[in-house]
Each structure stands twice: as structure tokens, then as C-alpha cells.
Amino acid sequence: EEELQIIQPDKSVSVAAGESAILHCTITSLFPVGPIQWFRGAGPARVLIYNQRQGPFPRVTTVSETTKRENMDFSISISNITPADAGTYYCIKFRKGSPDTEFKSGAGTELSVRAKPS
């Protein structure tokens, strides 16, 4: 089976305050089985932004139907962006288990927030 790659094609994304930000993430294999999670920041203090298996995440929606078994697009849209949302976002594949364990991370996408156009 093909080795899983996690592709975050955009190194950076710039969005005006109040708009929505789309953060792209695709995977190249359905294996290993397990959820995709999005985090802001790296290391122990990273913050969970989206998890397929829990929620709700009121400002986060998936761009495609992640519930479909063959889905490989785990891009998300974050609505009503504010300057406090700036940071680096990571798309991470977990291997199913008790608990799920981190398998592989995307390279990250840095979100910057522009002032609201007047």
C-alpha cells in the first residue's frame, strides 16, 4: 500500500478580518485507519481546531464530505476570522486506537490576518 503523505499546499494564507479562511489539506492514502485533526501551533500546547470525531466546532466546517469513506480532502474553512486567529495550522493524521496516536503531520499553513477593508 502507498505510504501516506499529508499535503498542505499553501505555506501561507492571508485573509481579511471578518472573512473566512480556507486551509487546504489532502491525504494520499486511506491507511492507516484513523481520524484527521487540525491544530493551531506545534508542541505540547497546540490547540485543537477540528477533529472529525468530536465537536461541535462552531466556526469550522469541512470543505468536502469527510464522512465519505473514500474522502481524501480534509480542507477546512474557518469563518469570521479575527487577528487572534493568526498562527500556523497543522493537518495531522492519527492512527485509530485507544487512544488514537499521532501518525503524520502536514508541513503547516501560516494564517495571517489583514485589517478589515474600510
Epitope: 508542541g43 505540547p44 500546547a45 497546540r46 485543537l48 487512544p99 499521532e102
Partner: antibody, heavy 117, light 108 residues
Framework: DVQLVESGGGLVRPGESLRLSCAAS????????VTWVRQAPGEGLEWVSL???????YYADSVKGRFTISRDNSKSTLYLQMNSLRAEDTAVYYC???????????WGLGTLVTVSS | EIVLTQSPGTLSVSPGERATFSCRAS??????LAWYQQKPGQAPRLLIY???TRATGIPARFSGSGSGTEFTLTISSLQSEDFAVYYC??????????FGGGTKVEIK
């Protein structure tokens, strides 16, 4: 409003155990790392332990092997199990919410642990 | 482990005056330095992170500067509520997260 409320402190003898709790509200507990920081009487702040959103745990060398941090996401509660307590563990223990920047933006009022014979 | 040294230990200042105190790291922390304020009997309060970014709700009279190993917290005009102990903390990505020993700002 974010609120963190510690409980479980008290007076114990050296070698005994104690379990601290921290009840969190006002934020999505499951999404954030949380931490314990302590302050001995008249002294400065000392980081004790942290648990990440995925449950990975980290400890200061001074408590490694004696203290265990855990979280119950269904109850939005953080715990610190303290075993083999020593006089030098006497302190006010604070729990705090951790931002993705690794800083502690909200703190509880603390609970006092006194270890004395 | 990164050791943070704060100076002076105590600073005596009159209300309305400017207060400046420092934090020195034993090795570079880039801009990953935070400042907290603690009043007697209270929990610490986050003031500054990333060396110079004010936390939510912190007045503009508080400002941070520095990078690498040398950092400064300045209170431009001390108010009565600013008399407290101030701690620095390095917030690089991985534990242990260390604090300085504190600077007590007292009324002159």
C-alpha cells in the same frame, strides 16, 4: 467567562498522597492544553506539569515519578495525583489554561498543599 | 533548562513615575518571553507574550521589549494598582517552562 477552580489541598505528612482537582468552565476544555504551576510560601512560580489535548504528559524534574497529571474531558476537569510528598512540595498549586503560544492566559485562585510532620 | 534572572529584586518607584526592569535568559529564547503580574493573595495575570505583545485587556502603559537573552518590561506611568511582583517566563515550544525569580515593585 473562563473560570478555573482548584480543590483538594490540605495538610499531609511526608510520604503521603493527595489528589488535586481543577474544574474548568467558560472555554472548550477538550481543545486546550492545561497545566499546574506551584508557588512555595514567599517564593516565586515553578512550573510543575502539563497535559496536552491529546493526553501527552510533561513534568518538571522535581516531581517526575511522584506526580501524575490527568484530565477528564467529559467533566472538564484537570487532576494532579501527588504521591511520596515532601516538605519541599509545600506550596499553593495553581491550574492554568495554556494558549498555543505556550503561555498561561487564565489561572485559578490556587489551593494550598502543606506537607509537614 | 533555561534559567531566567530578573533584576532588580525590588524596585521602589513613586506613583506616576516610569518603571523599567529586566529579565536575562541563560540561552537564547528568541522572542519567546512572557511577563506576568501577581498581587498579594492573587493568582498571576498574563501581561505580555512574544516579548512585546500585550495580552487581552492589558493597558498600553505596559510594554515589553528585547530578544535573544535580554528583555525589558516597562510601565510608563505607575498607577496604584501596578504595585505588585512581576515574573518573566520563557515560552519556547517545549517544557520545562521556566520563570524568573520576580521583581517586586513597591511604593517609594
Amino acid at each position: 467567562d473562563v473560570q478555573l477552580v482548584e480543590s483538594g489541598g490540605g495538610l499531609v505528612r511526608p510520604g503521603e498522597s493527595l489528589r488535586l482537582s481543577c474544574a474548568a468552565s467558560g472555554f472548550t476544555f477538550t481543545n486546550y492544553a492545561v497545566t499546574w504551576v506551584r508557588q512555595a510560601p514567599g517564593e516565586g512560580l515553578e512550573w510543575v506539569s502539563l497535559i496536552s489535548v491529546t493526553g501527552t504528559t510533561y513534568y518538571a524534574d522535581s516531581v517526575k515519578g511522584r506526580f501524575t497529571i490527568s484530565r477528564d474531558n467529559s467533566k472538564s476537569t484537570l487532576y494532579l495525583q501527588m504521591n511520596s510528598l515532601r516538605a519541599e512540595d509545600t506550596a499553593v498549586y495553581y491550574c492554568a489554561k495554556v494558549t498555543w503560544k505556550n503561555v498561561f492566559d487564565y489561572w485559578g485562585l490556587g489551593t494550598l498543599v502543606t506537607v509537614s510532620s | 533548562e533555561i534559567v531566567l534572572t530578573q533584576s532588580p529584586g525590588t524596585l521602589s518607584v513613586s506613583p506616576g513615575e516610569r518603571a523599567t526592569f529586566s529579565c536575562r535568559a541563560s540561552q537564547t529564547v528568541g522572542s519567546k518571553l512572557a511577563w506576568y503580574q501577581q498581587k498579594p493573595g492573587q493568582a498571576p495575570r498574563l501581561l505580555i507574550y512574544d516579548a512585546n505583545t500585550r495580552a487581552t485587556g492589558i493597558p498600553a502603559r505596559f510594554s515589553g521589549s528585547g530578544s535573544g537573552t535580554e528583555f525589558t518590561l516597562t510601565i510608563s506611568s505607575l498607577q496604584s494598582e501596578d504595585f505588585a511582583v512581576y515574573y518573566c517566563q520563557q515560552h519556547t515550544d517545549w517544557p520545562p517552562y521556566t520563570f524568573g525569580g520576580g521583581t517586586k515593585v513597591e511604593i517609594k
